[in-house]
């Protein structure tokens, strides 16, 4: 039985050219996290964090994605095309798979402030 919940940074906004931290947190379960996958709105993988083997950043994102903090992901040099949904998928044992959603809006305005809040989707 899957008892856990994924908390995410929810809907966030950040400036074009800036950076943003994508964070998910799995709570309310004792399940072991074996792998975390980070995906973009077009279903392409940005990164995988395997519990035993470490981080794999996909080649297309190598220059703009930094692993961490923790199981999160830092997306750098933001462009308007980065606006959209991001998904964290937690593979766990024995529970199975948990999935969280974050919506990132990249703003042109130089006065746009990065906003983030933890929420349960």
């Amino acid at each position: 039985m899957m008892t856990g919940t994924i908390e995410t940074t929810g809907n966030i906004s950040a400036k074009k050219g800036g950076s943003v931290i994508l964070q998910c947190h799995l709570s309310s379960t004792m399940a072991q996290v074996t792998q975390v996958n980070w995906e973009q709105h077009d279903h392409s993988l940005l990164a995988i964090r395997n519990a035993e083997l470490g981080w794999h950043i996909y080649p297309a994102f190598k220059d703009r994605v930094a692993p961490g903090p923790g199981l999160g992901l830092t997306l750098q040099s933001l462009t308007m095309n980065d606006t959209g949904e991001y998904f964290c998928t937690y593979h766990t044992y024995p529970d199975g798979t948990y999935r969280g959603r974050i919506f990132l809006e990249v703003l042109e305005s130089s006065v746009a402030e990065h906003s983030a809040r933890f929420q349960i989707p």
């Epitope: 792998q35 996958n37 392409s44 995988i48 395997n50 035993e52 083997l53 981080w55 794999h56």
Partner: antibody
Framework: DVQLQESGPGLVKPSQSLSLTCTVT?????????WNWIRQFPGNKLEWMGY???????SYNPSLKSRISITRDTSKNQFFLQLNSVTTEDTATYYC????????????WGQGTAVTVSS | DIVMTQSHKFMSTSVGDRVSITCKAS??????VAWYQQKPGQSPKLLIY???YRYTGVPDRFTGSGSGTDFTFTISSVQAEDLAVYYC?????????FGGGTKLEIK
């Protein structure tokens, strides 16, 4: 260049244990990556069995978890497969392979060793 | 388990032809797919990783594409030495699984 070479008995009796060795040259198994066992059944089906990582942690295919053990000897740069309580269904060609984190795929494979389970 | 299905066990082609081999995942695997080539009497060899990326030294006639559940491996101009079995493999989760293989036969 990285090379992997499997060795072990080609014939094992049912209910006994299958033990294979993979000798790695050209790369230290404690440096990085995951060191895997994969088998190929007659008819070509491939099955990932498990790995031992550079740090010594292991990950196994759940379908084999109760029967499989992967260990290593770092001084000889070797890792080992032990599969207990074998049946004729375990007849296959067994490969060792390196799983590279930068490609997230198996980039180097051994030549394979055929194992028949028969009385 | 994620099942990777290669619907064609055999494909027949001629030298110089373009051929595409398909692989379907039983559930979403994003772009976490690799393709391997196994020539007769040899071990598998990595050709494509993470869906579209060509491994070091692999000729550019080999390409991979797809995301989600549907993946395609293409040889733009088949050579005689491409006679082999081709496998897809997913690493979306920690139980890595392979497709059943597609044997490419040269007419």
């Amino acid at each position: 260049d990285v090379q992997l070479q499997e060795s072990g008995p080609g014939l094992v009796k049912p209910s006994q244990s299958l033990s294979l060795t993979c000798t790695v040259t050209g790369y230290s198994i404690t440096s990085d990556y995951a060191w895997n066992w994969i088998r190929q059944f007659p008819g070509n089906k491939l099955e990932w069995m498990g790995y031992i990582s550079y740090s010594g942690s292991t990950s196994y295919n759940p379908s084999l978890k109760s029967r499989i053990s992967i260990t290593r000897d770092t001084s000889k740069n070797q890792f080992f497969l032990q599969l207990n309580s074998v049946t004729t269904e375990d007849t296959a060609t067994y490969y060792c392979a390196r799983f590279m984190i930068t490609t997230f795929a198996m980039d180097y494979w051994g030549q394979g060793t055929a194992v028949t389970v028969s009385s | 388990d994620i099942v990777m299905t290669q619907s064609h066990k055999f494909m027949s082609t001629s030298v110089g032809d373009r051929v595409s081999i398909t692989c379907k995942a039983s559930q979403h695997v994003s772009t976490a797919v690799a393709w391997y080539q196994q020539k007769p009497g040899q071990s598998p060899k990595l050709l494509i990783y993470s869906a579209p990326y060509r491994y070091t030294g692999v000729p550019d006639r080999f390409t991979g594409s797809g995301s989600g559940t549907d993946f395609t491996f293409t040889i733009s101009s088949v050579q005689a030495e491409d006679l082999a079995v081709y496998y897809c493999q997913q690493h979306y989760n920690t139980l890595w699984t392979f497709g059943g293989g597609t044997k490419l036969e040269i007419k």
